[in-house]
C-alpha cells in the first residue's frame, strides 16, 4: 500500500522539515527560513509562531517543530500552548476584574495564580483546628478533642491572623 | 488597526522626572487598557502600570509604588506615564500596549516601538 500511495503521490515522499514543492515538480523542499513542517506530505511549511511583547521564547522554532512561548515574569501562560499570559497575584490573593484582591477572612491562596478558597473545616472530620489559617495557608487540622486523653496537654491554637471585624478588600 | 506610539523617553538625572506619553490612533481608547513594560538591556522585559478603560490602575512592579502614576485622557486618546524620584535601575526601554483588560495579554495585543529612557548623572 506504501508503495502504491508513492507512486500516485510523490509528496507522501516529504519528510516533515520539508514540503512538496509544486512549482519544482513536486520535489521535496526543505522549508525556509522561519516556517517548520511537523509531518511528511505536506505542500506548504507553516510560518512559526513568534513570541512577542508579554511572550517571551521557551523553545525555538525549528524545521520540524513550531516555536514555543510562555510568559515574561510577573505572567503565566493560560490557554493551550499559552496562547495569553495573565497577570501573577501574590499569595494571599486572587485575580478579579479590578487587578489582585486580598484573599477575604476564611479563605486563602497558597499560589501566585487561581482564586482564594475556603479553610478546611476541621469539625468536619472531627478534629480540632492545631494552627489557624491565614490569607496565605489553610488551617491545620489536629486530633479530635476525644483524641486526648484527660491529662493530656491540648495545644493552644495561636491568636488568629486577622482582628475579628476584619472587612475583606 | 491600533497603533500605539509612545514619546517623552530622554536622558535624566537620578531623582528627576520624566513624562512618558502613549497615544493611541485607529481606535478609540474607551475600549481598551493600556499597559507599560520596559526592558532594561540583558533582561527580561517586565511590566510597570496598567490602567483600565473605567480607569482602574494595575501596578505590576513593587519598585516603581509611589513613584510612577499614570492617567488616561480618551478625548487625546492618550495614557501618560508620570516617573519621579527616577532611579539608575529604571534605564530601560519603555513599551506602550493596549490588551483588552490589565491582567490578560495576547498575542492579538498592540505594542510601539518603544522609548529610551536613561537614568545617569
Known amino acids: 500500500f506504501e508503495r502504491t500511495r508513492s507512486l500516485q503521490d510523490p509528496c507522501s515522499n516529504c519528510p516533515a522539515g520539508t514540503f512538496c514543492d509544486n512549482n519544482r515538480n513536486q520535489i521535496c523542499s526543505p522549508c525556509p527560513p522561519n516556517s517548520f513542517s511537523s509531518a511528511g506530505g505536506q505542500r506548504t511549511c507553516d510560518i512559526c509562531r513568534q513570541c512577542k511583547g508579554v511572550f517571551r521564547t521557551r523553545k525555538e522554532c525549528s524545521s520540524t517543530s513550531n516555536a514555543e512561548c510562555d510568559c515574561t515574569p510577573g505572567f503565566h501562560c493560560l490557554g493551550a500552548g499559552c496562547s495569553m499570559c495573565e497577570q501573577d497575584c501574590k499569595q494571599g490573593q486572587e485575580l478579579t476584574k479590578k487587578g489582585c484582591k486580598d484573599c477575604c477572612f476564611g479563605t486563602f491562596n497558597d499560589q501566585k495564580r487561581g482564586i482564594c478558597r475556603p479553610w478546611t473545616n476541621c469539625s468536619l472530620d472531627g478534629k480540632s483546628v492545631l494552627v489557624n489559617g491565614t490569607k496565605e495557608r489553610d488551617v491545620v487540622c489536629g486530633p479530635s478533642p476525644a483524641d486526648l486523653s484527660p491529662g493530656a496537654s491540648s495545644v493552644t491554637p495561636p491568636a488568629p491572623a486577622r482582628e475579628p471585624g476584619h472587612s475583606p478588600q | 488597526e491600533v497603533q500605539v506610539v509612545e514619546s517623552g523617553g530622554g536622558l535624566v538625572q537620578p531623582g528627576g522626572s520624566l513624562r512618558l506619553s502613549c497615544a493611541a490612533s485607529g481606535s478609540s481608547l474607551d475600549y481598551s487598557a493600556i499597559g507599560w513594560f520596559r526592558q532594561a538591556p540583558g533582561k527580561e522585559r517586565e511590566g510597570v502600570l496598567c490602567i483600565s478603560s473605567s480607569g482602574d490602575v494595575t501596578i505590576y512592579a513593587d519598585s516603581v509604588k509611589g513613584r510612577f502614576t499614570i492617567s488616561r485622557d480618551n478625548a487625546k486618546n492618550t495614557v501618560y506615564l508620570q516617573m519621579n524620584s527616577l532611579k539608575p535601575e529604571d534605564t530601560a526601554v519603555y513599551y506602550c500596549?493596549?490588551?483588552?483588560?490589565?491582567?490578560?495579554?495576547?498575542?492579538?495585543?498592540?505594542w510601539g516601538q518603544g522609548t529610551q529612557v536613561t537614568v545617569s548623572s
Open positions: 500596549v493596549a490588551p483588552r483588560i490589565c491582567s490578560t495579554y495576547s498575542s492579538d495585543d498592540y
